[in-house]
C-alpha cells in the first residue's frame, strides 16, 4: 500500500499551531533582518 | 519493513557537542516526522523534539531549546540530534523514533548511549 | 507541563496472574479535536521501548490481545490479563494532547 503523505502523520496534526506559529515567527524575525540590512545599506 | 539504525556510543567532556545520527529505511524519509527522545541511566522517557524532514519544520522541548540541534540529510535518509554545552546530565541513552497516522511512537532506534564525563 | 503520574511504581507479579498499572494525569489530556492521545509503551532490559496502545485502547499492530488499555480524562489503567515471562519490564504511559509532549516515570514489572 502506498505511504501516507506527511500531513497524514498524526504528528503533523498535534503539532500544526505551534509549527505553524513558528514559521510566522522565522518568517518575521527574517523580514526584521532583512529591514536592518536595507537601513544599513 | 521499517527500520532506524543509529550511530554508535559516545564518550564526551563536559562542555563539549555531540551528534548522533539515526539511518532511516523501508518507508519514504519524507513522509514522517522525526523525533528524539533520551532516557538517563535507570530514569524515564523525555521528548526531546521533533523535525519534519520534508520542509524542516522543527519543534523543540523548552527544556532543550537553545542546546539541541535537529537536521536530515534527505539525500540518505538520515536525521541527526546534536546537542551542546553538554554537562553530566546528559548522559543518558538517545533515541530516534516515527510514528504513523495514529500513534506518535511507533517504531524505535536502537539507541545511543552518550556519556558525558570528565 | 502536564505530569504523568503512574503506580505501582514497581509490580511484583505471578506468572499466569492478571496485572493493572494504572496512570494519572495532572489535568484532561482530551485533546481539542475531542481525542485523548494517551499511550503506553512497554521496554524490556536493554531493549528500546516499544509501542502498545495509542488512543486510550487501541493496541497497536503485532501486540497481544492480553494486553488492554482503559480510561478517560485523567484516569487511564493498562491491563494485561495473564502476565507471561516476556511481558517482564517496564511499562510507560504517555501524552502527546498537550505540549511538551510527556511520559509518566514507569511501572517495573518483575517476578514476585
Known amino acids: 500500500s502506498e505511504e501516507p503523505p506527511i500531513s497524514l502523520d498524526l504528528t503533523f496534526h498535534l503539532l500544526r499551531e505551534v509549527l505553524e506559529m513558528a514559521r510566522a515567527e522565522q518568517l518575521a524575525q527574517q523580514a526584521h533582518s532583512n529591514r536592518k540590512l536595507m537601513e544599513i545599506i | 519493513q521499517v527500520q532506524l539504525v543509529q550511530s554508535g556510543a559516545e564518550v564526551k567532556k563536559p562542555g563539549a557537542s555531540v551528534k548522533v545520527s539515526c539511518k532511516a529505511s523501508?518507508?519514504?524519509?519524507?513522509?514522517?516526522?522525526m523525533k528524539w527522545v533520551r532516557q538517563a541511566p535507570g530514569q524515564g522517557l523525555e521528548w526531546m523534539g521533533v523535525i519534519n524532514p520534508n520542509q524542516g519544520d522543527i519543534f523543540y522541548n523548552q527544556k532543550f531549546k537553545g542546546r539541541v540541534t535537529m537536521t536530515v540529510d534527505k539525500s540518505i535518509s538520515t536525521a541527526y540530534m546534536e546537542l551542546s554545552r553538554l554537562r553530566s546530565d546528559d548522559t543518558a541513552v538517545y533515541y530516534c523514533a516515527r510514528g504513523t497516522d495514529r500513534a506518535l511512537f511507533a517504531y524505535w532506534g536502537q539507541g545511543t548511549l552518550v556519556t558525558v564525563s570528565s | 507541563d502536564v505530569v504523568m503520574t503512574q503506580s505501582p511504581l514497581s509490580l511484583p507479579v505471578t506468572l499466569g496472574q492478571p496485572a493493572s498499572i494504572s496512570c494519572r494525569s495532572g489535568q484532561s489530556i482530551v485533546h481539542s479535536d475531542a481525542n485523548t492521545y494517551l499511550e503506553w509503551y512497554q521496554q524490556r532490559p536493554g531493549q528500546s521501548p516499544r509501542l502498545l496502545i495509542y488512543?486510550?485502547?487501541n493496541r497497536f499492530s503485532g501486540v497481544p490481545d492480553r494486553f488492554s488499555g482503559s480510561g478517560s480524562g485523567t484516569d487511564f489503567t493498562l491491563k494485561i490479563s495473564r502476565v507471561e515471562a516476556e511481558d517482564l519490564g517496564v511499562y510507560y504511559c504517555f501524552q502527546g494532547s498537550h505540549i511538551p509532549w510527556t511520559f509518566g516515570g514507569g511501572t517495573k514489572v518483575e517476578i514476585k
Open positions: 523501508g518507508y519514504t524519509f519524507t513522509d514522517y516526522f
Open positions: 488512543k486510550v485502547s
